[in-house]
């Protein structure tokens, strides 16, 4: 009579994290009598998994009726798989005696643990940055097995080149994180662009997960400002507008100095938006001409998300009859409350 | 293919610990035995221990006392520190990766590292 | 803890010629499986020790066929059908059924 063979037809098996596992081994004779015992690992230091004579295997059952005198199938079910499971499992037949002896091995069984990546976080800098500048935001992922995984990065569709990636460990483990820092040039048009990180992994089939974060949380675009004079309302006043334009984010507080003194401080409220996110919002003066005997010099300064102020200035000459004109100036911090001025803003 | 190298200091002084490292390169810790074995001069080869990939070890008795080995899976690197040294534990220390599959024995000490020479001097 | 002995100590060898090691364990390395775990190793001078046989008869991979491992029990036997230059070196017995692994003390190959 031939020699009884154990037969682990599989040589691997890969399972999703919490599904079940079945390690399938027949033997080829019912002699020797003895049971079987299925282990994890080979040699000293191999871990019993399963033993059809005695024991309490909670996460173990046998697919078919081991009990019964002529089954020769041992196959086992592991539940609730986790990465921690991975290892190559033997199902090894023992000779009955006192105490049973080891009698053959299967050629042994690779299970490996397919677990998902969580979904990816990406997060940018810490402070806003300008147009130009160039900014990095890092996407991570964890817990996922194998370690095999690609993850690419995109900018409104459009894929980014300038990122570095890692994988830890670099050894062995039941489960994986991916760390990437990408990157990316801000525009003056990046208030309404997305940095996506996308991750792709042998677990999701072909449907990669993504994790997004917005530009605007990102970007600082300064505002150009426009200061005018308009046509006269009255024979004793003139209109100034100061025009602020493409500017984010909204936080914004303006000030009108007269030669240098505060006149009206005001904080951008009912603003206009753009196209591309950014803002536009108007500030006015109307300045009583009369009541001063020398040019006046008129600057509109704006304070912008914390920022250094930035200003514009315009000369109002009031020997003459007021016409539109304009300057540039530097910026001035000088403050007193001035009469004889009034503003407004839209 | 597989390579294993050993590194630590090659002088270590009587009564202090003897630390090695050795690092596997190009392959994987899972389903083997990564184990130490020492040389000393002109004489034949002795079985220091091992570590199994699930973290059981195993010491030669005759050392068991002064001898830990641990695995760092992470970094793919396996470890031997060796407490109270003495001139008798000068010797090339050798880290070895060791095959089983075939039961309850071993398969044979497939890779070895190149030998890092450790002499106990004061 | 299992006892290695090697014989003989140095083996003076001709090139071309067979050779024969031969190792003993103070108990049997057959375990109820059908394997008997007995490795065999050459160290050439130099350099670190190189797998040849494991399980008593089975050449490790890249192991030249003119070495061959027989034996079962406690004594087993290593064979060189022709011995060649590179051949030179220390070899080793070493049992692998149960730790303490224990090595033989060495037999010296060199050429005559």
């Known amino acids: 009579e031939e020699e009884l063979q154990v037969i682990q037809p599989d040589k691997s098996v890969s399972v999703a994290a919490g599904e079940s596992a079945i390690l399938h081994c027949t033997v080829t004779s019912l002699i020797p009598v003895g049971p079987i015992q299925w282990f994890r690992g080979a040699g000293p230091a191999r871990e019993l998994i399963y033993n059809q004579k005695e024991g309490h295997f909670p996460r173990v059952t046998t697919v078919s009726e081991s009990t019964k005198r002529e089954n020769m199938d041992f196959s086992i079910s592991i539940s609730n798989i986790t990465p921690a499971d991975a290892g190559t499992y033997y199902c090894v037949k023992f000779r009955k005696g006192s105490p049973d002896t080891e009698f053959k091995s299967g050629a042994g069984t690779e299970l490996s643990v397919r677990a998902k990546p969580s979904a990816p976080v990406v997060s940018g800098p810490a402070a806003r940055a300008t147009p130009q500048h160039t900014v990095s935001f890092t996407c991570e992922s964890h817990g996922f097995s194998p370690r095999d995984i690609t993850l690419k990065w995109f900018k409104n569709g459009n894929e980014l080149s300038d990122f570095q990636t890692n994988v830890d460990p670099v050894g062995e483990s039941v489960s994986y994180s991916i760390h990437s820092t990408a990157k990316v040039v801000l525009t003056r048009e990046d208030v309404h662009s997305q940095v996506i990180c996308e991750v792709a992994h042998v677990t999701l089939q072909g449907d990669p997960l993504r994790g997004t974060a917005n530009l605007s949380e990102t970007i600082r675009v300064p505002p150009t400002l426009e200061v005018t004079q308009q046509p006269v309302r009255a024979e004793n006043q003139v209109n100034v507008t100061c025009q602020v334009r493409k500017f984010y984010p909204q936080r914004l507080q303006l000030t009108w100095l007269e030669n240098g003194n505060v006149s009206r401080t005001e904080t951008a409220s009912t603003v206009t938006e753009n196209k591309d996110g950014t803002y536009n919002w108007m500030s006015w003066l109307l300045v009583n001409v009369s009541a001063h005997r020398d040019d006046v010099k008129l600057t509109c300064q704006v304070e912008h998300d914390g920022q250094p102020a930035v200003s514009k200035s315009h000369d109002l000459k009031v020997s003459a009859h007021p016409k539109e004109q304009g300057s540039n100036t530097a910026a001035e911090n000088t403050g007193s409350n001035e009469r004889n001025i009034y503003g407004g803003s839209g | 293919q597989v390579q294993l190298q050993e590194s630590g200091p090659g002088l270590v002084r009587p009564s202090e610990t003897l630390s090695l490292t050795c690092t596997v390169s190009g392959g994987s810790i899972r389903n083997y035995y990564w184990s130490w074995i020492r040389q000393p001069p002109g004489k034949g080869l002795e079985w220091i221990g091992f570590i199994y990939y699930n973290g059981r070890t195993f010491y030669n008795p005759s050392l068991k006392s002064r001898v830990t080995i641990s695995l760092d899976k992470s970094k793919n690197q396996f470890s031997l520190k060796m407490t109270s040294v003495t001139a008798a534990d000068t010797a090339v220390y050798y880290c070895?990766?060791?095959?089983?599959?075939?039961?309850?024995?071993?398969?044979?000490?497939?890779?070895w590292g190149q030998g890092t020479t450790v002499t106990v001097s004061s | 803890d299992i006892v290695m002995t090697q014989s003989p100590l140095s083996l003076p060898v001709t090139p071309g010629e067979p050779a024969s090691i031969s190792c003993k364990s103070s108990q049997s390395l057959l375990y109820s499986n059908g394997y008997a775990y007995l490795d065999w190793y050459l160290q050439r001078p130099g350099q670190s020790p190189q797998l040849l046989i494991y399980l008593g008869s089975n050449r490790a991979s890249g192991v030249p066929d003119r070495f061959s491992g027989s034996g079962s029990g406690t004594d087993f036997t290593l064979k060189i059908s022709r011995v060649e230059a590179e051949d030179v070196g220390v070899y080793y017995c070493?049992?692998?059924?149960?730790?303490?692994?224990?090595f033989g003390g060495g037999t010296k190959v060199e050429i005559k």
């Open positions: 070895a990766r060791v095959r089983a599959y075939s039961g309850i024995g071993l398969d044979g000490t497939d890779v």
């Open positions: 070493m049992q692998a059924l149960q730790t303490p692994l224990t």
